[in-house]
């Protein structure tokens, strides 16, 4: 299987929440005998690997954030830790996993990682990555909305967020 | 809150076979990754026994396999270390843990312990 | 199997100084960028309590003065200024291959 990135960049004004969002592709085994692990991060341009490098996300590490279920299921963070930092990451059955931050902060502008591990017994991985840029701005210049950019053109959308 | 909690005879005899139970609460073990048994003699450093999945598959430590069986009874959220031809030298405190994943793999909860003494 | 050697087998230190815990491994338990290593902290008729995993990542409840380095076959378990309750046997894990295995342990006590 492969992730993908629908959008590769979203511009979003300051005190707006968005929604960043992976989604796996291909066969997905739904055996019982496999279980998923997915996560976000933060990360940096300029690695010879991207996402190689795995920092916090508002203090919230990688482990804070994951998400751990069969591939029958769906599954979110119900974490009061991750909700008192704005944040909740989500999957459903389709194969999207997403991050929501509320009241974004210039802070929050930077490189973003979704990561998914394949597990199997015993103890064997598959580990697949996606990564997408957030900019946040203030000021005149700022959009009213977020914009996103979709990942195979240049042509960008705007959207409401929730 | 994920509590395990060993159980099983503390004294057993030389030939004998070692049967114990380690209950689960607050954790399913058929929606966790593995659900394993370690064992530490007197004074000594700890040492893997072997685990079975949430799938039902199981994995031995070699030097013990063919002596060993982990089953498990999900109705009772349950999983049996059973451990054949028992030994003086099979003294130890007995634990079974799960298994998380973060870039390693590493026992995140544990059992209070079940100490077994191998005597005649 | 993988042998996990520590050193040493016991420290004396007191409150508030500085612990450094080895652990060196027989091959390298990295995979993908990650150590598969971990360290455990056990006191006297006590399970053995996760402490850091994955070389450097420290478990949720944790105190920071805890931290963990290093990569292939050298890792270090820190303890930047010893609590009285610090004071136990630490043992370094890895979970690179089977068997998973333990190292001897470093006892840790009151200087």
């Known amino acids: 299987f492969k992730v993908a990135t629908p959008y590769s960049l979203y511009v979003c004004p300051e005190g707006q929440n968005v929604t960043l969002t992976c989604r796996l592709l291909g066969p997905v085994d739904k055996g019982h005998d496999v279980t998923f692990y997915k996560t976000w991060y933060r990360s940096s341009r300029g690695e010879v690997q991207t996402c190689s490098e795995r920092r916090p996300i508002r203090n919230l590490t990688f482990q804070d954030l994951h998400l751990h279920h069969g591939g029958h299921q769906a599954a979110n963070t119900s974490h009061d830790l991750a909700q008192r930092h704005g944040l909740e990451s989500a999957s459903d059955h389709h194969g999207n996993f997403s991050i929501t931050m509320r009241n974004l902060t210039l802070l929050d502008s930077g490189l973003y990682c979704c990561l998914v591990v394949e597990i199997r017994h015993h103890h064997s991985e598959h580990r697949v990555h996606g990564a997408m840029e957030l900019q946040v701005q203030t000021g005149k210049d700022a959009p009213s909305n977020c914009v996103v950019y979709p990942s195979s053109s240049q042509d960008s959308e705007n959207i409401t967020a929730a | 809150q994920v509590t395990l909690k060993e159980s099983g005879p503390a004294l057993v005899k030389p030939t004998q076979t070692l049967t114990l139970t380690c209950t689960v609460t607050?954790?399913?073990?058929?929606?966790?990754?593995?659900w394993h048994w370690i064992r530490q003699p007197p004074g000594k450093a700890l040492e893997w026994i072997g685990d079975i999945h949430k799938s039902g598959s199981t994995n031995y430590n070699p030097s013990l396999k063919t002596r060993l069986t982990i089953s498990r009874d999900t109705s009772k959220n349950q999983f049996v270390l059973t451990m054949t031809n028992m030994d003086p030298v099979d003294t130890a405190t007995y634990y079974c843990?799960?298994?998380?994943?973060?870039?390693?793999?590493?026992?995140?909860?544990w059992g209070q312990g079940t100490t077994v003494t191998v005597s005649s | 199997d993988i042998v996990l050697t520590q050193s040493p087998a016991t420290l004396s230190l007191s409150p508030g100084e500085r612990a450094t815990l080895s652990c060196r491994a027989s091959?390298?338990?990295?995979?993908?960028?990650?150590?598969?290593m971990n360290w455990y902290q056990q006191k006297p008729g006590q399970a053995p309590r996760l402490l850091i995993y994955g070389a450097s990542n420290l478990e949720s409840g944790i105190p920071a003065r805890f931290s963990g380095s290093g990569s292939g076959r050298d890792f270090t378990l820190t303890i930047s200024s010893l609590e009285p309750e610090d004071f136990a046997t630490y043992y370094c894990?890895?979970?690179?291959?089977?068997?998973?295995?333990f190292g001897g342990g470093t006892k840790l006590e009151i200087k």
């Open positions: 091959q390298s338990v990295d995979y993908d960028g990650d150590s598969y």
């Open positions: 894990q890895q979970s690179i291959e089977d068997p998973w295995t």
């Open positions: 843990a799960r298994d998380y994943y973060g870039f390693s793999w590493y026992f995140d909860v």
């Open positions: 607050g954790y399913s073990i058929t929606g966790g990754y593995n």
